[in-house]
C-alpha cells in the first residue's frame, strides 16, 4: 500500500486513480495513508470523480477513513439517495491522519476514468466545537498553529489537565459579625475540580449561626453519600456534613466563634451550588439605662459582645465619671456579658467660681454661690475709681463651662481707671505756689533717676513725662525709681512703681531745644487706683476750648521753691495760659536761640512773674478742668523756661499735649 508523505515533509499533494486520466483497470486496490503533524488535520477535495455506480458503492469505490471512523464511501459521478459522489465537498481528517482506499471490482459495464484529488495539511482550530459538544476549554481557548491552550478568568487557576479551570477559593477569612458566602459563580454553575476553604473567625465570645439561603444544588448520587461534590462545615467542636443534593440544609448553630467551610468539586456536572448567610450571637449585656439628663445612642433591642453605646448629655450637662469630667463616653459589651465601663452621670455644667476681677468685684445673681448652667453673675468695678469698659458685666454660665458675657466674650470685663478725679474742684492760688492736700493731684508721680523729676499717671500702667527728664535712662528703664500716692517727697509711705520701658518721642533731640519734649514710661505692673493714685485724663478733641489764652491751668511738683530747695511737700500753682505770640517774643531775645518756642509748646505764667514751675518739676502735668466732664486733663508737660524761675516777662514753657494724642495712643496700644 503506497504511503503518503510523512511529516515533517511538506504535507500537500495530489492523488489519482491508476491510469488517470485514462480509465482505471479492474481488480484494482490502492491505499494511501496521509499523516500531518500533531495539531494539524488533512483537507481533501476532488477535482475529478468518475467511478462505477453501484448500490451502496459495493463495486467500485473510494473510501476515506480517519482512524477507526469511515468518513465517506464514494462512487458514481453524482450522489443519489443511497450513494455519494464527492462533488464539490471538502473532506477533513478527524485527527492528523487520513486513509484513502481505492478499489475496483472485476468488471465495468463501461469505461470509467477514476478520480483526481488534492490534499493539504491545515491547522486544526481546536477551539471550535460542534453544537452540543463539550467546549475544549473551561474558560478561554486560544488556538495556534499546531495546537491550542486554555486559560482562566481571574480568581481561577488552570488544572493540571490543562483544560479545566479550578476556582481559587481558599483562604477567604470572614471577620465581620455577619455576612454572606457562596460557592464560586453562584447562582451560576460552580467550577469543576475545585477545592474551596472559607473561614469565619470572630472574636472569642461570639457564636456563629449558619443559614443556607435561596437555593442549594450540589451534585449527588442516589446511593452513595456525596461521592462527587460536597460541602463540609467544621468547628472546633464538631463536623457538619457532607452536604449535597438539592435540599437546603437546616440552620447550624455552631456554638463556636470559628468555622471552616470546605467545598470540593469533581471534573463533571453542572450545578448551581449554595449560599450561606451567617450571623453571630453572644451573651447579651444588661440593657443600658440612660442617666438622668442623658440619652443612649444607638438604641438597640439588645447589646451583645462588641456592641457599644454612647451617652450624650442634654445641653448644659456634662459627662462625669465619679468626679472626673469626660469629653465623651462609649461603653463596649464584653464576652462575659458585662459592660467595660460603668455608667457615667450627666451632671449639670458648673462654670466654677468666677475669676476675681482686678479692681472690681462679682455678685451672684441666681443665688449665693450658684455657678451651674444658666447661672448669672454680675461683675462691677470698684466705684468712683474704676469704670467698666464696653461690657455690661453680666455673665452667664454656658454649656461649655465658661462664664460668657452677653456679647459672647469669655474673657473678663476690664475695669478701667476713672481719670481726672481730684479732691480739688476749683482753681485755688512750685514756685510761688502752695501746699497740695491729699487727693488734690493723685496723678502726680515722682521720678528719681539721677535727678528729681515728675510725671503724670495715665491709665494704671503708664506715666507721661518730659523727654528731657528721662533721656539719660532711655536705655536703662529699670534705673528709674517711680513713686506715687504721697504728697511728701521724703516719706517712705509711697507706692513704688518700676519702669518696664521708656518711649521718647522720635522728634526730640537732646540738648538741641525742647521741641517734642514728651515721653511715656510703661510700668511693669498696674497700680491700684485710689483717692491718692488716680490717672489724669488725656485731652479730648474739644479740650482746646478750655486752654485759650488766660484760661487757668495748674502745675504741681516738688521742684525748687523760692527758698531754692526742692519742696518737701507737693506744691502747686495756678497760672494762666499766655498768648503764643507773646511767649514766642519773650524767648526771641538772647540768650535764647530764635525759634525756641514752637507750635508744639504752650506757655503759662504771670507777666509780673512770681508763679512758675521750676527745676525738679520737669515732666509734671499742667492740668485743666474740663467743665463739661468735670474731669481734669493734662494740657501741658513742664518742659523749660527762664533760668530764673518766676522771672517777670518770662513764662514757663510746656509741651502741648493735644498735639501728641495720636503718638500717645499708638504707643499705648502697641505696647
Amino acid at each position: 500500500t503506497p504511503l503518503g508523505p510523512k511529516w515533517p515533509e511538506p504535507v500537500f499533494g495530489r492523488l489519482a486513480s491508476p491510469g488517470f486520466p485514462g480509465e482505471y483497470a479492474n481488480d484494482q486496490e490502492r491505499r494511501w495513508t496521509l499523516t500531518a503533524p500533531p495539531g494539524y488535520r488533512l483537507r481533501l477535495y476532488f477535482t475529478h470523480f468518475d467511478l462505477e455506480l453501484s448500490h451502496l458503492c459495493e463495486y467500485d469505490f473510494v473510501k476515506l477513513s480517519s482512524g477507526a471512523k469511515v468518513l465517506a464511501t464514494l462512487c458514481g459521478q453524482e450522489s443519489t439517495d443511497t450513494e455519494r459522489a464527492p462533488g464539490k465537498d471538502t473532506f477533513y481528517s478527524l485527527g492528523s491522519s487520513l486513509d484513502i482506499t481505492f478499489r475496483s471490482d472485476y468488471s465495468n459495464e463501461k469505461p470509467f476514468t477514476g478520480f483526481e484529488a488534492f490534499y493539504a495539511a491545515e491547522d486544526i482550530d481546536e477551539c471550535q466545537v460542534a453544537p452540543g459538544e463539550a467546549p475544549t476549554c473551561d474558560h478561554h481557548c486560544h488556538n495556534h498553529l499546531g495546537g491550542f491552550y486554555c486559560s482562566c478568568r481571574a480568581g481561577y487557576v488552570l488544572h493540571r489537565n490543562k483544560r479545566t479551570c479550578s476556582a481559587l477559593c481558599s483562604g477567604q477569612v470572614f471577620t465581620q459579625r455577619s455576612g454572606e458566602l457562596s460557592s464560586p459563580e453562584y447562582p451560576r454553575p460552580y467550577p469543576k475540580l475545585s477545592s474551596c476553604t472559607y473561614s469565619i473567625s470572630l472574636e472569642e465570645g461570639f457564636s456563629v449561626i449558619l443559614d443556607f439561603v435561596e437555593s442549594f444544588d450540589v451534585e449527588t448520587h442516589p446511593e452513595t453519600l456525596c461521592p462527587y461534590d460536597f460541602l463540609k462545615i467544621q468547628t472546633d467542636r464538631e463536623e457538619h456534613g457532607p452536604f449535597c443534593g438539592k435540599t437546603l440544609p437546616h440552620r447550624i448553630e455552631t456554638k463556636s466563634n470559628t468555622v471552616t467551610i470546605t467545598f470540593v468539586t469533581d471534573e463533571s456536572g453542572d450545578h448551581t451550588g449554595w449560599k450561606i448567610h451567617y450571623t453571630s450571637t453572644a451573651q447579651p449585656c444588661p440593657y443600658p439605662m440612660a442617666p438622668p439628663n442623658g440619652h443612649v445612642s444607638p438604641v438597640q433591642a439588645k447589646y451583645i459582645l462588641k456592641d457599644s453605646f454612647s451617652i450624650f448629655c442634654e445641653t448644659g450637662y456634662e459627662l462625669l465619671q465619679g468626679h472626673l469630667p469626660l469629653k465623651s463616653f462609649t461603653a463596649v459589651c464584653q464576652k462575659d456579658g458585662s459592660w467595660d465601663r460603668p455608667m457615667p452621670a450627666c451632671s449639670i455644667v458648673d462654670c466654677g467660681p468666677p475669676d476675681d476681677l482686678p479692681s472690681g468685684r462679682v455678685e451672684y445673681i441666681t443665688g449665693p454661690g450658684v455657678t451651674t448652667y444658666k447661672a448669672v453673675i454680675q461683675y462691677s468695678c470698684e466705684e468712683t475709681f474704676y469704670t467698666m469698659k464696653v461690657n455690661d458685666g453680666k455673665y452667664v454660665c454656658e454649656a461649655d463651662g465658661f462664664w460668657t458675657s452677653s456679647k459672647g466674650e469669655k474673657s473678663l470685663p476690664v475695669c478701667e481707671p476713672v481719670c481726672g478725679l481730684s479732691a480739688r474742684t476749683t482753681g485755688g492760688r512750685i514756685y510761688g505756689g502752695q501746699k497740695a492736700k491729699p487727693g488734690d493731684f493723685p496723678w502726680q508721680v515722682l521720678i528719681l533717676g539721677g535727678t528729681t523729676a515728675a510725671g503724670a499717671l495715665l491709665y494704671d500702667n503708664w506715666v507721661l513725662t518730659a523727654a528731657h527728664a528721662v533721656y539719660e535712662q532711655k536705655h536703662d528703664a529699670s534705673a528709674l525709681d517711680i513713686r506715687m500716692g504721697t504728697l511728701k517727697r521724703l516719706s517712705p509711705h509711697y507706692t513704688q512703681a518700676w519702669s518696664e520701658a521708656v518711649f521718647i518721642h522720635e522728634g526730640y533731640t537732646h540738648d538741641a531745644g525742647f521741641d517734642n519734649d514728651i515721653a511715656l514710661i510703661k510700668l511693669n505692673n498696674k497700680v491700684v487706683i485710689n483717692s491718692n493714685i488716680t490717672p489724669i485724663c488725656l485731652p479730648r478733641k474739644e479740650a482746646e476750648s478750655f486752654m485759650r489764652t488766660d484760661d487757668i491751668g495748674t502745675a504741681s511738683g516738688w521742684g525748687l521753691t523760692q527758698r531754692g530747695f526742692l519742696a518737701r511737700n507737693l506744691m502747686y500753682v495756678d497760672i494762666p495760659i499766655v498768648d503764643h505770640q507773646k511767649c514766642t517774643a519773650a524767648y526771641e531775645k538772647p540768650p535764647y536761640p530764635r525759634g525756641s518756642v514752637t507750635a508744639n509748646m504752650l506757655c503759662a505764667g504771670l507777666e509780673s512773674g512770681g508763679k512758675d514751675s521750676c527745676r525738679g518739676d520737669s515732666g509734671g502735668a499742667l492740668v485743666f478742668l474740663d467743665s463739661e466732664t468735670e474731669r481734669w486733663f493734662v494740657g501741658g508737660i513742664v518742659s523749660w523756661g527762664s533760668m530764673n524761675c518766676g522771672e517777670a516777662g518770662q513764662y514757663g514753657v510746656y509741651t502741648k499735649v493735644i498735639n501728641y494724642i495720636p503718638w500717645i495712643e499708638n504707643i499705648i496700644s502697641d505696647f
Epitope: D481, K488, L490, S491, P492, H493, Y494, Q496, W498, R568
Partner: antibody, heavy 121, light 106 residues
Framework: QVQLVQSGAEVKKPGASVKVSCKAS????????MHWLRQAPGQGLEWIGD????????HYIEKFKDRATLTIDKSSSTAYMELSSLRSEDTAVYYC??????????????WGQGTLVTVSS | DIQLTQSPSSLSASVGDRVTITCSAS?????MYWYQQKPGKAPKLLIY???NLASGVPSRFSGSGSGTDNTLTISSLQPEDFATYYC?????????FGQGTKVEIK
C-alpha cells in the same frame, strides 16, 4: 555723731500702758521719719509704725493701730512710743530707728539701744 | 504681707570661711536690706538697696539678688562677724523682716 538714746527698762502689769522715749542728736531731727520696732525674747524684728518728725504724721501697722501712739517733741528732738492695754505677749525690746532719706527711705540707718518692756502680773 | 524666709536658720563656720545667707521672698521685691545684730545690741545696717554697702561696713560683706531671691555674702568670716543677720523688705506694705540667721563659731 548721730545717735538715738532710749529710756530705760520698764516693768508693767497687764492692762497698763508704757511710754518709751527716744532722744535724737547729731542730725536735723525734722528731716527724718522715726520708726519704732520691737523684738520679743529670742524672736525676730517686728515693725510697729513711724512718725514724720516734720509734721507729726503717723502710720501704724494694722496690729498696733488701736494701741500704739507715736508722738514727737521737736523742741527736745525726742520721739515717744506709747503702748496701751499691755499683755504678756508685748514683752519685748522696743527700738526706735531713724528712717533713711537718701535713697528709698525704706530702711533704718541709725538705731536706739533698745528698751526692754516686761509685762508681768 | 510678703514673707521672708532666711536659710539656713543657723550655721557654724570658722574664721576665714566664706559664708552665704539667702533670703527668699513670697513675692518679688525690688530692694533688700540686711542688718547685723549682736546679743544684747540693736541691729546695725549692713546693706541697703540690695547691694550697696552702708557707711563704715567692711567690704567683705556684699549683697546681691533680684526678684524673690537675695543673698548676703561674707567673703572671709572674721571673729567680730559672729552674730544674727536679718533681711528686710518694704517693696510691699507693710515692711517685714526675715526670721534671722545665726552665725556661730565652729
Amino acid at each position: 555723731q548721730v545717735q538715738l538714746v532710749q529710756s530705760g527698762a520698764e516693768v508693767k502689769k497687764p492692762g497698763a500702758s508704757v511710754k518709751v522715749s527716744c532722744k535724737a542728736s547729731g542730725y536735723t531731727f525734722t528731716n527724718h521719719h522715726m520708726h519704732w520696732l520691737r523684738q520679743a525674747p529670742g524672736q525676730g524684728l517686728e515693725w510697729i509704725g513711724d512718725i514724720d518728725a516734720s509734721d507729726s504724721e503717723t502710720h501704724y501697722i494694722e496690729k498696733f493701730k488701736d494701741r500704739a501712739t507715736l508722738t514727737i517733741d521737736k523742741s527736745s528732738s525726742t520721739a515717744y512710743m506709747e503702748l496701751s492695754s499691755l499683755r504678756s505677749e508685748d514683752t519685748a525690746v522696743y527700738y526706735c530707728a531713724r528712717g533713711d532719706i537718701t535713697t528709698t527711705l525704706r530702711y533704718f540707718d541709725v538705731w536706739g539701744q533698745g528698751t526692754l518692756v516686761t509685762v508681768s502680773s | 504681707d510678703i514673707q521672708l524666709t532666711q536659710s539656713p536658720s543657723s550655721l557654724s563656720a570658722s574664721v576665714g570661711d566664706r559664708v552665704t545667707i539667702t533670703c527668699s521672698a513670697s513675692s518679688s521685691v525690688r530692694y533688700m536690706y540686711w542688718y547685723q545684730q549682736k546679743p544684747g545690741k540693736a541691729p546695725k545696717l549692713l546693706i541697703y538697696d540690695t547691694s550697696n554697702l552702708a557707711s563704715g561696713v567692711p567690704s567683705r560683706f556684699s549683697g546681691s539678688g533680684s526678684g524673690t531671691d537675695n543673698t548676703l555674702t561674707i567673703s572671709s568670716l572674721q571673729p567680730e562677724d559672729f552674730a544674727t543677720y536679718y533681711c528686710q523688705q518694704w517693696s510691699s506694705y507693710p515692711l517685714t523682716f526675715g526670721q534671722g540667721t545665726k552665725v556661730e563659731i565652729k
